[in-house]
């Protein structure tokens, strides 16, 4: 029995819906009391949510997945996954029996966005060309852990005396906080990028420091 | 009446073959997953080997893997186990069982059982 | 390969007493669960299935509980016929499908 999923990863965002694709080809004359579904962890093989005995057997998975009744008969055999959470992602095997066995992996990969970074100075006063300073760029509650890259005016990288550290929370997202030390010069920008590298998405931090006073932008 | 009846069963030496029969009368053979189960003398039930509905898809324990062949004939309504390289280990009561519904699943019809003893 | 556990090994309980029979599965196996019955030189017969469903024409006193890991089959009030060796066999996702090694209920 053929049973088909998605070959990329379905990619879903922390709190929002995810649709778990999965289909077989019913044969003519096909009724739902023919249906064996089994949706499962593929690791653990634990049990996420099943259709036997011509009915919905119910989530087995935190109550937070469904299954769409109305098009199982067609052989779409897709999950909703709802609320999604850092703890779900993995892969998820659709195993489907009528008159014969047939299973396929599906891959979740979920992501939040990381805030728009904030700028610190330390020391944030009194300051001089030639003086060593720390500047911090934290963002927060994001996922997958996130590229952190650091640039001068010019956009030019900068990667000595960098100091990047992720830690995550109770939910799984990570802040990240990136120190970079540099010498000052007469006057130069400092900017911080933090990449998702599932999303694709940029968020931008920067510090302007022109003598006095300085600018955070 | 939904009947089983196994038979082939006897007495054979270590390295042998025997070939189990059984009988499906009273249901659409042709429609459901088959199964063989065993049980040596004084133990309990193992599950040996599956076949669905048009013999596309077979399942054996690890233990019989190599050595045992499930078939099944649905125009004569009978399944088959052919048993090669029997070990004394293979010594048992077969059962044949017909899944309760299209997909496999639990047992609800067994046979009487047929004796295979293993022995020189 | 999924492991089912059954316990006690032997049940001593007299008649009209009530028994409690335990399956426990190495992992989790849903409600792919059956229960079967087996007096000494017949087949067994199918009891439960989907963990708690009663088979066709098993009397009310047998039911079945329990999902994922954890599996009891209960025989209310037992009679001089349910004293038997009783196993229980998942069903879940591929083959092989094994049984527990079986719980014996005998007349105390």
């Known amino acids: 029995l053929e049973v088909q999923v998605p070959e990329d990863p379905v990619v879903a965002l922390v709190g929002t819906d995810a649709t778990l694709c999965c289909s077989f080809s019913p044969e003519p004359g096909f009724s739902l009391a023919q249906l064996n579904l089994i949706w499962q962890l593929t690791d653990t093989k634990q049990l996420v949510h099943s259709f036997a005995e011509g009915q919905d057997q119910g989530s087995a998975y935190a109550n937070r997945t469904a299954l769409f009744p109305d098009l199982l008969a067609q052989g779409n055999a897709s999950l909703r996954l709802q609320r999604v959470r850092v703890a779900d992602e993995g892969s998820f095997t659709c195993f489907v029996s009528i008159r014969d066995f047939g299973s396929a992996a599906v891959s979740l990969q979920v992501a939040a966005p990381y805030s728009k970074p904030s700028m610190t100075l330390e020391p944030n006063k009194d300051l001089r060309p030639g003086d060593t300073v720390t500047i911090t760029c934290s963002s927060y509650r994001g996922y997958p852990e996130a590229e952190v890259f650091w640039q001068d005016g010019q956009g030019v990288p900068l990667t000595g005396n960098v100091t990047t550290s992720q830690m995550a929370n109770e939910q799984g997202l990570f802040d990240v906080h990136s120190v970079l030390r540099v010498v000052l010069g007469a006057n130069g920008t400092y900017s911080c990028l933090v990449r998702n590298p599932v999303l694709q998405q940029d968020a931008h931090g920067s510090v302007t420091i022109t003598g006095q006073p300085m600018t955070f932008p | 009446e939904v009947q089983l009846l196994e038979s082939g069963g006897g007495l054979v030496q270590p390295g042998g073959s025997l070939r189990l029969s059984c009988a499906a009368s009273?249901?659409?053979?042709?429609?459901?997953?088959m199964t063989w189960v065993r049980q040596a003398p004084g133990k309990g039930l193992e599950w040996v080997s599956a076949i669905n509905w048009n013999g596309n898809s077979t399942h054996y324990a690890d233990s019989v893997k190599g050595r045992f062949t499930v078939s099944r004939d649905n125009s004569k309504n009978t399944l088959y186990l052919q048993m090669n390289s029997l070990r004394a280990e293979d010594t048992a009561v077969y059962y044949c069982a017909k899944s309760r519904t299209t997909y496999y699943s639990s047992m609800d019809v067994w046979g009487q059982g047929t004796t295979v003893t293993v022995s020189s | 390969e999924i492991v089912l556990t059954q316990s006690p090994g032997t049940l001593s309980l007299s008649p009209g007493e009530r028994a409690t029979l335990s399956c426990r599965a190495s992992?989790?196996?849903?409600?792919?669960l059956a229960w079967y019955q087996q007096k000494p030189g017949q087949a067994p017969r199918l009891l439960i299935y989907g963990a708690s469903s009663r088979a066709t024409g098993i009397p009310a006193r047998f039911s079945g509980s329990g999902s994922g890991t954890d599996f009891t089959l209960t025989i209310s009030s037992l009679q001089s016929e349910d004293f038997a060796v009783y196993y229980c066999?998942?069903?879940?996702?591929?083959?092989?499908?094994?049984f527990g090694g079986g719980t014996k209920v005998e007349i105390k």
């Open positions: 992992q989790t196996v849903g409600s792919y």
């Open positions: 009273g249901f659409t053979f042709s429609d459901d997953w």
């Open positions: 066999q998942h069903y879940y996702d591929w083959p092989p499908y094994s």
